[in-house]
């Protein structure tokens, strides 16, 4: 009854500092409520980037001030992280928790290395 989570190894953010990736999980049970958390790991320190709980069949709802948005389809979650800068380059881990009904199950992906390159400033025009 293992809970496996898959996510891409590498993603490149676009010029506007937006990165998207899919987090897919193999559910050992029939969960009706799922929580998805994006964690950033840097130098063995782990911090929460964003989190959302959703009912199966419904949309993910992140907090209004979250830098994440997402959609769900079955056991697949499409995550988008916005407002990234070069200093935010790092390993972003997808954690999936089956919250209800019990028993609780948890799965963690191996992480997606997100590379962010700050855009070059536009040259002054005479």
């Amino acid at each position: 009854k293992a809970m496996h989570v898959a996510q891409p190894a590498v993603v490149l953010a676009n010029s506007r500092g937006t990165a998207s990736f899919v987090c897919e999980y193999a559910s050992p049970g029939k969960a009706t409520e799922v929580r998805v958390t994006v964690l950033r790991q840097a130098d063995s320190q782990v911090t929460e980037v964003c989190a959302a709980t959703y009912m199966m069949g419904n949309e993910l709802t992140f907090l209004d001030d979250s830098i994440c948005t997402g959609t769900s389809s079955g056991n697949q979650v499409n995550l988008t992280i916005q407002g990234l800068r070069a200093m935010d380059t790092g390993l972003y881990i997808c954690k999936v928790e089956l919250m209800y009904p019990p028993p609780y199950y948890m799965g963690i992906g191996n992480g997606t290395q997100i590379y962010v390159i700050d855009p070059e400033p536009c040259p002054d025009s005479d």
């Epitope: 293992a2 782990v46 881990i93 919250m99 609780y104 199950y105 799965g107 963690i108």
Partner: antibody, heavy 119, light 108 residues
């Protein structure tokens, strides 16, 4: 720094009730699952209960189901354990513990509060 | 429920020696969701290892964890006087979250 401080333990007669509290500080309380773990005198560790994030989802060990209720007040950064119909076998040190971000292992523990059930 | 068994029950060693503690699960622990704790008399437990092999913050590198599936090991490469304590393993892949009965490491 992360701090967890339990209170509410004491001596109570069998069949009576007791409420334990755990005051948390030094972290964003609502982002973590919070647990109670107990240890009977001279025995090993036993997980008792967990309450997740916003407090809607909870889970219990079979040994306490129906007699113990876990709750939290995120506005007060406080975790609770309501213990009813207490038995002698509930005698233990009760620890409040924070679940880790990478899973429900216990990365910070309180100092524990002793509950003694005796007539 | 996943039942964890620890061996040996007691390990008698001298400072400077290597300690090898075993934790065996009744069924596979998904994705190595296993933790190790140290507990000294009168104190709360302290997290040493999570994810079977990741050291917790501030834990000396003489502590290492390994294993997967049903067999896990905690190794203390060179015992320091402060390492004599009881060690517990715990699985956290699914509820109920269970502990092993503990291994006591005492001074020979």
């Amino acid at each position: 720094q992360v701090q967890l401080v339990e209170s509410g333990g004491g001596v109570v007669q069998p069949g009576r009730s007791l409420r334990l509290s755990c005051a948390a500080s030094g972290f964003t309380f609502s982002s973590y699952g919070m647990h109670w773990v107990r240890q009977a005198p001279g025995k090993g560790l036993e997980w008792v209960a967990v309450i997740w994030y916003d407090g809607r989802n909870k889970d219990y060990a079979d040994s306490v189901k129906g007699r113990i209720t876990i709750s939290r007040d995120n506005s007060k950064n406080t975790l609770y354990l309501q213990m009813n119909s207490l038995r002698a076998e509930d005698t233990a040190v009760y620890y409040c513990a924070r679940g880790g971000l990478l899973g429900p292992y216990f990365d910070y523990w309180g100092q524990g509060t002793l509950v003694t059930v005796s007539s | 429920e996943i039942v964890l068994t620890q061996s040996p029950g007691t390990l008698s060693l001298s400072p400077g020696e290597r300690a090898t503690l075993s934790c065996r699960a009744s069924q596979s622990v998904s994705s190595s969701y296993l933790a190790w704790y140290q507990q000294k008399p009168g104190q709360a437990p302290r997290l040493l290892i999570y994810g079977a092999s990741s050291r917790a913050t501030g834990i000396p590198d003489r502590f290492s964890g390994s294993g997967s599936g049903t067999d896990f090991t905690l190794t203390i490469s060179r015992l320091e006087p402060e390492d004599f304590a009881v060690y517990y393993c715990q699985q956290y892949g699914s509820s109920p979250f269970t502990f092993g009965p503990g291994t006591k490491v005492d001074i020979k």
